[in-house]
């Protein structure tokens, strides 16, 4: 049978030929009658065999990290017969390890983030070195980790490479640290090989700083003409934290929040002072408000850093603006009777300069030839008024500061012209009618009505009468219906067309005004030749009416 021990060859041997061991058959009596052969990958190139003795040699420098074992085949042949003495057999050559590889950190670069103010013992990151040497061969690949840079803030567990915090750190003082870790093989014994890596440790922010106003006093100004919602200035607090932890909210302490407000610009983290209610220089020309600031997000466990909110005082000066005159009333309504003489008093308007210098005021009435106004605001008529032409005047009064004619205010002025009884009633239309020659007494020949251009406080009431002459010449009579109409009736029997073809009746119409006015109105009555049925046969009036296009009924 075959006789051999396990074969080992140390790696990295520099000799041209290194004896590994011997392969031999127990039938070999040492008389050089057997021939040994080596077959397989590496035979002849990496390993050779002494054909006579079976001694095996490595003729190449081997690298265990490249290849740690070779499986070869051995043959032994009887030189005399050429036959195999033993069956072909496989054997293994193992490459034994030497400590020729330093530890390497293969997962570089290392970077970790840990919250600032983390307590001692907090795990930061684990670094791992690899050693290409054989972990089963002594201590060649047994590593120990140590810290070359990073004390006193960090420590490393010697066997695991776990980096932990060993002292609290404040991001606001230093926000990142470079830690250098060394890995040594041979568990750090003499002759050990080492490798190093750098770890960038960044501190993430926690909200351990409250915002603080940079200034204890801000001076701002606002124009009294500024509308509500106007931004009048900004205030700024500073927070040493970053990101969400530096987001802040500004507010005004409750007692001061009537006239002003503060809103927060979350992009710039500024407080914007806003006008909440209009200010008036003449009423109050300065204000003092106290603002406070606090963080938007504060976890419960960090409230200890945020007990007292930072405050600042804001002095706001109101800037005087030359304001236009201010009328006592938003509009004026005056009444004046029609037909009052030119220069009659209508009313008084009044405007004042709201500013402290109290400029005198001048007044004017726009687009009016009917009214005048003087520097005292007294309005008078410049023409006689006729209510029946215009019952209302819609005007505009302008007040101008004497010292600054650009400061103008205007308000509406309404003047109502009151009625006086200056128009007598009249026929509501032109009346012209006819009477038949054969008309009997008491026959109604016309109903009349009247109108009056005056305005009546009560309803108009008209009174109808015949004139004195017509009353005496009693061919016709009138009856007042008491409803502002009257009827004309014949007062005799029979009329003669040839003798008296037309009658002109004067009718007096009086109104119920004080004093009462009366007008005389003429009613024309034509005499016609009528048939038995009452239809007109011959009538100058009819021809007249037909030629003029009047209706006869």
């Amino acid at each position: 049978g075959w006789v051999w021990n396990q074969f080992f060859v140390p790696e990295e041997m520099n000799t041209t030929s290194h004896h590994i061991g011997q392969l031999r058959s127990d039938l070999d009596n040492g008389n050089n009658s057997f021939q040994y052969k080596l077959l397989g990958a590496g035979a002849g190139s990496t390993f050779i065999i002494d054909e006579r003795t079976g001694d095996i040699y490595a003729i190449q420098k081997l690298d265990r990290e490249e290849r740690s074992l070779y499986i070869l085949r051995a043959q032994v042949i009887d030189i005399a017969t050429g036959r195999a003495v033993e069956p072909e057999s496989e054997f293994v050559i193992k490459v034994s390890d030497i400590n020729d590889n330093e530890p390497k950190f293969l997962d570089e670069p290392y970077e970790a983030i840990v919250p600032e103010m983390s307590p001692e013992g907090t795990l930061v990151i684990q670094v791992t070195a690899s050693d290409a040497d054989d972990p089963s061969s002594g201590n060649n690949a047994r590593l120990l980790y140590s810290l070359l840079q990073g004390q006193p803030y960090f420590s490393v567990e010697p066997t695991t490479g776990v980096i932990r915090i060993s002292s609290k750190m404040d991001r606001e003082l230093q926000d990142e640290y470079w830690v250098i870790i060394q890995a040594k093989d041979m568990i750090g014994q003499p002759g050990a090989l080492s490798g190093t890596t750098s770890v960038l440790i960044k501190l993430s922010d926690v909200n351990d700083n409250k915002p603080i106003f940079k200034e204890s006093l801000y001076r701002l100004t606002v124009s009294e003409s500024a509308p509500t919602g106007t931004s009048i200035g900004t205030i700024m607090a500073y927070d040493n934290d970053i990101g969400e932890n530096a987001e802040m909210d500004y507010s005004i302490e409750e007692d001061d929040s009537q006239t002003f407000d503060i809103i927060t610009n979350h992009e710039t983290q500024e407080g914007i002072v806003i006008l909440k209610k209009k200010v008036d220089f003449e009423h109050q020309n300065h204000y003092g408000i106290r603002a406070k600031v606090k963080n938007h997000h504060v976890p419960e466990q960090l409230m200890k850093y945020h007990t007292e909110a930072s405050t600042t005082f804001i002095k706001i000066q109101v800037e005087d603006v030359d304001e236009p005159p201010l009328f006592l009333l938003p509009y004026y309504v005056f009444e004046v009777f029609e037909e009052t003489p030119q220069g009659s008093f209508v009313g008084v308007v009044s405007a004042t300069d709201p500013d402290n210098r109290k400029s005198p005021i001048r007044y004017s009435i726009t687009r009016s030839k009917v009214f005048n106004i003087n520097d005292n605001g007294t309005i008078t008529t410049s023409n006689s008024l006729d209510r029946e032409i215009s019952a209302w005047y819609n005007l505009s009064i302008t007040a101008t500061e004497k010292y600054n004619i650009e400061q103008i205010s205007s308000i509406p002025l309404y003047v109502q012209v009151l009625n006086i009884n200056d128009h007598a009633p009249e026929f509501s239309q032109y009346y012209e009618t006819y009477v038949c020659e054969n008309a009997g007494s008491g026959q109604v020949i016309q109903t009349i009505s009247a109108v009056d251009r005056d305005e009546s406080i009560e309803e108009h009431h008209f009174y109808f009468n015949l004139s004195v002459e017509d009353t005496n010449n009693s061919s016709f009579t009138i009856i007042d219906n008491q409803d502002n109409t009257a009827v004309i009736l014949t007062n005799r029997t029979g009329f003669n067309l040839q003798e008296e073809p037309v009658f002109y009746i004067s009718i007096l119409i009086a109104d119920n005004g004080i004093p009462s006015l009366t007008s005389t109105n003429t009613l024309t009555i034509h005499v016609c030749d009528c048939g038995d049925s009452g239809s007109t046969q011959t009538c100058q009036y009819q021809e007249l009416v037909l030629s003029m296009g009047f209706k006869t009924e």
Epitope: L39, G40, A41, D63, R64, E65, E66, R67, L106
Partner: antibody, heavy 120, light 108 residues
């Protein structure tokens, strides 16, 4: 896990040099115990081993191609490369890169392969 | 160089049947140095068996390998539709490293 990806021109002119790169991801090329290999497969044919390299630079080539083949490694980029000079149409093939167990010689994993055509 | 001869060149079987693929070496190869691969069209080869009989990670147990010296066998106990492919053997026992010519396993 380790993955391999071949890259390079799909068309090479005769007599020129074919150049391919294999990028290793999911693991370091610098770990011991493995060779980094190139294999090719002619269209419709079997597999032919070209050669391999250890990350420290030692190379092993198929004697049939040895005069024309160079395999190199760039550990900083986790890549290894193949150069095949003086190509002819007979070098048209799908070229694969693969990791080889250095003790027992099996190929795993493989890249997905890249077809290189040699034509003018 | 060691020449690996695979036979049959083509094997026609139906799903559910047993497949036996052979690989013969021109000279003795250590069983530790023999591997089997599966290749589907348009894909890279995939390691099935290493050391003549050890299944690679993720390979179903219907695949098994055996043999020593010069004769090695890949057996698929019960064919699944996805098993129809080309199979290659490969040796590492002698330089240069070589592959067999392949056996095409096709659906009958």
């Amino acid at each position: 896990q380790v993955q391999l990806q071949e890259s390079g021109p799909g068309l090479v002119k005769p007599s020129q040099t074919l150049s391919l790169t294999c990028t290793v991801s999911g693991g370091s090329i610098s770990r011991g115990g493995y060779y980094w290999s190139w294999i090719r497969q002619h269209p419709g044919k079997g597999l032919e081993w070209i050669g391999y390299i250890f990350y420290r630079g030692r190379t092993y080539y198929n004697p049939s191609l040895k005069s024309r083949v160079t395999i190199s490694v760039d550990t900083s980029k986790n890549q290894f490369s193949l150069k095949l000079s003086s190509v002819t149409a007979a070098d048209t093939a799908v070229y694969y890169c693969a990791r080889v167990n250095s003790n027992y010689g099996w190929f795993d994993p493989w890249g997905q392969g890249t077809l290189v055509t040699v034509s003018s | 160089e060691i020449v690996l001869t695979q036979f049959p060149g083509t094997l026609s079987l139906s799903p559910g049947e047993r497949a036996t693929l052979s690989c013969r070496a021109s000279q003795s190869v250590s069983s530790s140095y023999l591997a089997w691969y599966q290749q589907k069209p348009g894909q890279a080869p995939r390691l099935l068996i290493y050391g003549a009989s050890s299944r690679a990670t993720g390979i179903p147990d219907r695949f098994s390998g055996s043999g020593s010296g010069t004769d090695f066998t890949l057996t698929i106990s019960r064919l699944e539709p996805e098993d129809f492919a080309v199979y290659y053997c490969q040796q590492y026992g002698s330089s240069p490293l070589t592959f067999g010519g392949g056996t095409k396993l096709e659906i009958k």
